[in-house]
Interface confidence: low
């Protein structure tokens, strides 16, 4: 809290302009009007002030809007949303993508911040949805951002939005969080033909059904390994030694190298080995030849 | 790229008005200030004042208040620095210079070629 | 206002050789407000250094800042043939901005 002090003569600012990283913090909040402030944001921003006269800055800012700042203020803070709590955030209503920009810029090339998160969380959902614009201003800024949210905040997500996404949006996603995308991203691509269609899905694969894999490998795709490393075990699981050598192509002879690995090695104990020996990769664990096998879905749905 | 490009050198009589000025490109002008700074022959560099291009506010080391006048046209993102009755020892060449951005700044970033201003009878 | 004063006035070095130049200000700049330019006949300045020891943007690694409150140096740890030139510090705690007068580091 900064002691309440006289503005000395001459020294009240007329306006907010570089003389003022000259003022120690005292008579920053004496000579300085938060009025003044507020409708003079956009210069803060291109004066060098320190992080101790920012503090001076914010607790005129605050005292000014106790409820929350408007957003004509908002979208100019600039380096003093740095200052902001999570708390101060929840107070805004942002409803403009130019001011989540400017916000999201501030905070460029560092880690999330909680008071990033809170911005994000309270534009969201002010819109409603996660529209395509917001995505791709989320995701550009923040790679990681769709894979931190819950699948119960994905289902938010239109299927126009998918559009948006990289490959690289998606590197940290969990099966649960592409079970959600993958049935908005097949609808989103389904007007593509086969390579194009490809192309684009492949990202999304981890939440694709058995029966999608077992389409796509009708196709010719030729699925690199660290795709199929990344496909729901359970989805795999009933894939034939024939539908794997065609989905993977001439990338078949990988699974020599992941054998140990899931989903291959579970894949591998469900074949029958003979199957297996079709490929000449040398992979061992399969069902031995004259054993029955039972279809465990079937078994499944019979009990 | 980012840079500031000045008009040519000029050569006055003592009395005669100027304007000279500094064009900025390859980045937002109105989101900068732009400092002058002038440099007397043989000599260092002075402090003269700056400006905030997007509403023209200016503000002026004591020692070139009232001598010179900053300004700004934001739609053709130049500054100029201009003189109503020059005297000889105005002769110098006269940069601008753009304020570094934000915590970071305060120190001068980018920096036009200079005009040399030449009064002589 | 604050004066900035610069030593030596020259200083005659050969490529190679360490130069280290001297800002003193007669008070203190604090946050560290100093800034190092570098001028070479017939060109504008060029900015080296901000924040008393933050190198700008394309300056060589050889060139650094250091020091605080009144005493600031820059230091060039091996002089080569471009570096010839007049270097300039610059202070922007205190209302007006100043400039030193400046080092010359020529060739001996």
């Known amino acids: 809290e900064v002691e309440k002090t006289a503005c000395p003569s001459g020294k009240k600012a007329r306006e907010i302009d570089e003389s003022l990283i000259f003022y120690k913090k005292w008579e920053l909040e004496a000579c300085v009007d938060a009025a003044l402030l507020a409708t003079q944001m956009d210069r803060v921003n291109a004066i060098p002030f320190t992080y101790e006269q920012l503090d001076v800055l914010k607790h005129k800012l605050d005292e000014l809007y106790p409820q929350g700042y408007p957003e004509s203020v908002i979208q100019h803070l600039g380096y003093l949303f740095l200052k902001m709590s999570p708390e101060d955030i929840r107070k805004w209503n942002v409803t403009s993508l130019e001011t989540l920009k400017a916000l999201l810029e501030v905070n460029k090339g560092h880690e999330m911040s909680p008071q990033v998160a809170t911005l994000i969380d309270r534009f969201v959902k002010g819109r409603g949805q996660l529209d395509k614009d917001t995505l791709d201003t989320l995701t550009a800024f923040y790679p990681g951002y769709l894979c931190s949210l819950s699948p119960e905040e994905l289902s938010s997500v239109p299927p126009s939005s998918i559009w948006a996404v990289r490959p690289q949006d998606l590197d940290t996603c969990d099966p649960r969080q592409l079970d959600v995308l993958y049935p908005k991203a097949r609808l989103a691509f389904q007007n593509m033909n086969g390579s194009e269609y490809f192309v684009k899905i492949q990202s999304f694969l981890g939440g694709a059904p058995t029966e999608d894999l077992k389409a796509l490998s009708q196709q010719n795709v030729s699925m690199d390994l660290a795709t199929f490393m990344k496909l729901r075990t359970d989805a795999v699981l009933p894939l034939t030694v024939a539908e794997v050598q065609k989905l993977l192509g001439p990338h078949v002879e990988g699974l020599k190298a992941e054998e140990r690995h899931r989903p291959v090695r579970d894949w591998i104990l469900r074949q029958r080995q003979d199957d297996l020996d079709t490929l000449g990769l040398g992979l061992q664990g399969g069902i031995p030849n004259g054993y029955l096998v039972l279809d465990l879905s079937m078994q499944e749905a019979l009990s | 790229q980012v840079q500031l490009v000045q008009s040519g050198a000029e050569v006055k009589k003592p009395g005669e008005s100027l304007k000279i000025s500094c064009k900025g490109s390859g980045y937002s002008f109105t989101n900068y200030w732009i400092g002058w700074v002038r440099q007397m022959p043989g000599k260092g560099l002075e402090w003269m004042g700056f400006i905030w291009p997007s509403d023209s506010w200016t503000s002026y080391s004591p020692s070139f208040q009232g001598q010179v006048t900053i300004s700004a046209d934001k739609s053709i993102s130049t500054a100029y620095l201009q003189w109503s009755s020059l005297k000889a020892s105005d002769t110098a060449m006269y940069y601008c210079?753009?304020?570094?951005?934000?915590?970071?700044?305060?120190?001068?970033?980018?920096w036009g070629q200079g005009t040399l201003v030449t009064v002589s009878s | 206002d604050i004066v900035l004063t610069q030593s030596p006035a020259t200083l005659s070095l050969s490529p190679g050789e360490r130069a280290t130049l001297s800002c003193r200000a007669s008070?203190?700049?604090?946050?560290?407000?100093l800034a190092w330019y570098q001028q070479k006949p017939g060109q504008a300045p060029r900015l080296l250094i901000y924040g008393a020891s933050k190198r700008a943007t394309g300056v060589p690694a050889r060139f650094s800042g250091s020091g605080s409150g009144t005493d600031f140096t820059l230091t060039i740890s091996s002089l080569e043939p471009e570096d010839f030139a007049t270097y300039y510090c610059q202070q922007y705690y205190d209302f007006p901005p100043t400039f030193g007068q400046g080092t010359k580091v020529e060739i001996k």
């Open positions: 210079a753009r304020y570094g951005h934000g915590m970071y700044g305060g120190a001068l970033d980018v």
């Open positions: 008070q203190s700049v604090r946050s560290s407000r």
